[in-house]
Amino acid sequence: HTVELNNMFGQIQSPGYPDSYPSDSEVTWNITVPDGFRIKLYFMHFNLESSYLCEYDYVKVETEDQVLATFCGRETTDTEQTPGQEVVLSPGSFMSITFRSDFSNEERFTGFDAHYMAVDVDECKEREDEELSCDHYCHNYIGGYYCSCRFGYILHTDNRTCRVECSDNLFTQRTGVITSPDFPNPYPKSSECLYTIELEEGFMVNLQFEDIFDIEDHPEVPCPYDYIKIKVGPKVLGPFCGEKAPEPISTQSHSVLILFHSDNSGENRGWRLSYRAAGNECPELQPPVHGKIEPSQAKYFFKDQVLVSCDTGYKVLKDNVEMDTFQIECLKDGTWSNKIPTCKIVDCRAPGELEHGLITFSTRNNLTTYKSEIKYSCQEPYYKMLNNNTGIYTCSAQGVWMNKVLGRSLPTCLPECGQPSRSLPSLVKRIIGGRNAEPGLFPWQALIVVEDTSRVPNDKWFGSGALLSASWILTAAHVLRSQRRDTTVIPVSKEHVTVYLGLHDVRDKSGAVNSSAARVVLHPDFNIQNYNHDIALVQLQEPVPLGPHVMPVCLPRLEPEGPAPHMLGLVAGWGISNPNVTVDEIISSGTRTLSDVLQYVKLPVVPHAECKTSYESRSGNYSVTENMFCAGYYEGGKDTCLGDSGGAFVIFDDLSQRWVVQGLVSWGGPEECGSKQVYGVYTKVSNYVDWVWEQMGLPQSVVEPQVER
């Protein structure tokens, strides 16, 4: 009979064991264990009848298709075998054990005691067959095993081979190299690789296989296992395999698909190819006259670009547009994207107008092209070029007029100062009062009219000032101070100030330049109690044009001593001859109390100590500070008066041969103007030179060339 055993271990004994087994007996034990296990069988006791080749009694161990062992007897002989210490191992998970006794036993035989157990199969060690073994890594466990793959590989659905994901390779560069995965190592199994070369339309892909070419093949059937196919539009080239690479392929297309297929077996090294884009050739190019083409090549193909540039002093001209460079491109149809432009000489065009200046052309026909030369000059004698610049400008390669020092900036024509169009008389008779000034004698003289319309009725007064530049007037702070204040110093609104320049006769303002104020700047330390720091500036709304009747006066050098005692200076003004008259009467045309024609007087500088003493001897709190100086005569008769305030006291500077403003008419009194021993007090301008330049926003160096040393 047959006994089915399914346990992982067990014991098998001969019938009647440990008594002797019966005759004519046959028992089969079928042992089945799970897959991944084999069966190990060994005997603890064995005693059967001996016979030649175990013909009588025996124990036979077998699998489905193979006898593993036949045992009988008590001890092994040449013709019979006992198990002894031998272990029987099934190749698979099934083992069949058959016990048989014949009809007669000459003596009593005790039979056998056997044990079996399921033992794990180490598939990783034992699988020799490539068809079954793991492609990369094998991992054994009790009852089974599994496979895994190297980095970058994926386990195939057969759970054994390792493939790669290589179906998404896009190449868009004009040249490139494509290889089988892992090249030059063997390519992965069970893979479907797809390589797409997609170039811009107009290019054609050329393929060339290089180095090793090794794809599994078959001696009879063309490429049944692994292969390359090349798809160009509807056309398919290949399959290719074996060890001989295909010849270079000119696809005549900008789009190519390369398919590579590998099956689940084989160890081949794969392939490598390079591809290159080819384009249509464009015609040869000739550089323009006075120009060049970069890069310079014998041949140009689709997508090649060239840059056309011109020699120094020339500009690329394309469709009447000037440019520095022009780029053209070889198109897919083998034509150039544009015609070669021409090179045109750079033209700086008409040079910029110079305020208060003139332009002369050094080159014939007033040429304004590259390397042409012009010369700027200032309107002399009223303006002089700053820093004694040459004024020479050359047309540069960039198309701009360039000066060696100033670059593309225009020169500056600075007003000349202290040089009247008429020379001032060197001697003035010591007469009582002043005399009429000829037009152009005091071209810096300004009449400042202040009309404060913010009060009802309006306040109106006037004073004098001195032109320092085309935009700035120097005057006394008390002229521009809001009059309705007792001790506080607040400037009048700029809207209330009008400045007249080039004025000779106040009855005829038609020839004068009148200007509004853009800014009114009082010295921050002006003291209304003692008139210390009595200096102010008016910035004009627009620069005034200079000419014979309108020219600035020079500022002095910074010297705390001020003008030397007994030096003679001139001061001009339309001041009041009768001090008891009101400004409204002065401004109205019917009165002669305001001098119609500009008056001037020559006065000597009074030693400081003498002036201080003359004022200290008076009742009242008079203070002649170091920021003031006095001028006039002990006996009186000549003086400045109301309405002259802010006017310039000028002294001729022998070094520079120019008239310099040393003082500003400030105060005097309390007696009438021109009284005996009543000196006029003037603001000492030389103490404020830095402050004046700072307010005007000009570096002091600007003025240095004007007052040569």
Partner: antibody, heavy 113, light 112 residues
Amino acid sequence: QVQLVQSGAEVKKPGASVKVSCKASGYTFTGKWIEWVRQAPGQGLEWIGEILPGSGSTDYNERFKDRATFTADTSTSTAYMELSSLRSEDTAVYYCVRSEDLWGQGTLVTVSS
Amino acid sequence: DIVLTQSPDSLAVSLGERATINCKSSQNLFNSRTRKNYLAWFQQKPGQSPKLLIYWASTRESGVPDRFSGSGSGTDFTLTISSLQAEDVAVYYCKQSYIPFTFGGGTKVEIK
């Protein structure tokens, strides 16, 4: 015609603030100073300060510097005077004046608890 | 601040008679630059706003009767009503126009 029209009478509690308005017409409001003057019942005139509407410049009588604020709205040609921390002695008629010829009709401000 | 002292405090004058009001300043009000005295005179009738009569010490405002005149310079100023009319009954104030502006205490003019 040229005139200054002031806001109506106000009654305020001590410690409160009052804002009196003065609307100008008939001249260029921005270019002339507006003064503020007050007159306590049966008393003389007292100058509070002034504003130039175009620039916003102001001058204050020291006595009122901490409590009075002048403003001007040029779009409506209206000047304002605000007086804070009111006390009973601030009871007065407050005038705005175009410096210095044209007077408003006055605004009575009564400060009473 | 400049202090203005008006005198007398009140004045009773017969109709057609001259009325004189004085105003003394603690500081000189003459401005040598504009050659003006910054002093004005105002008239305030009962229940009305003040009205400008004289500015710059002596200039009559337009529309003001010529019986009103101003004089003086520096620190001493006078308002004169040459022939008092019934409509001239009012309080008269002087005002100086250096900031901060100040007013005199006022002079009440009545008919005797």
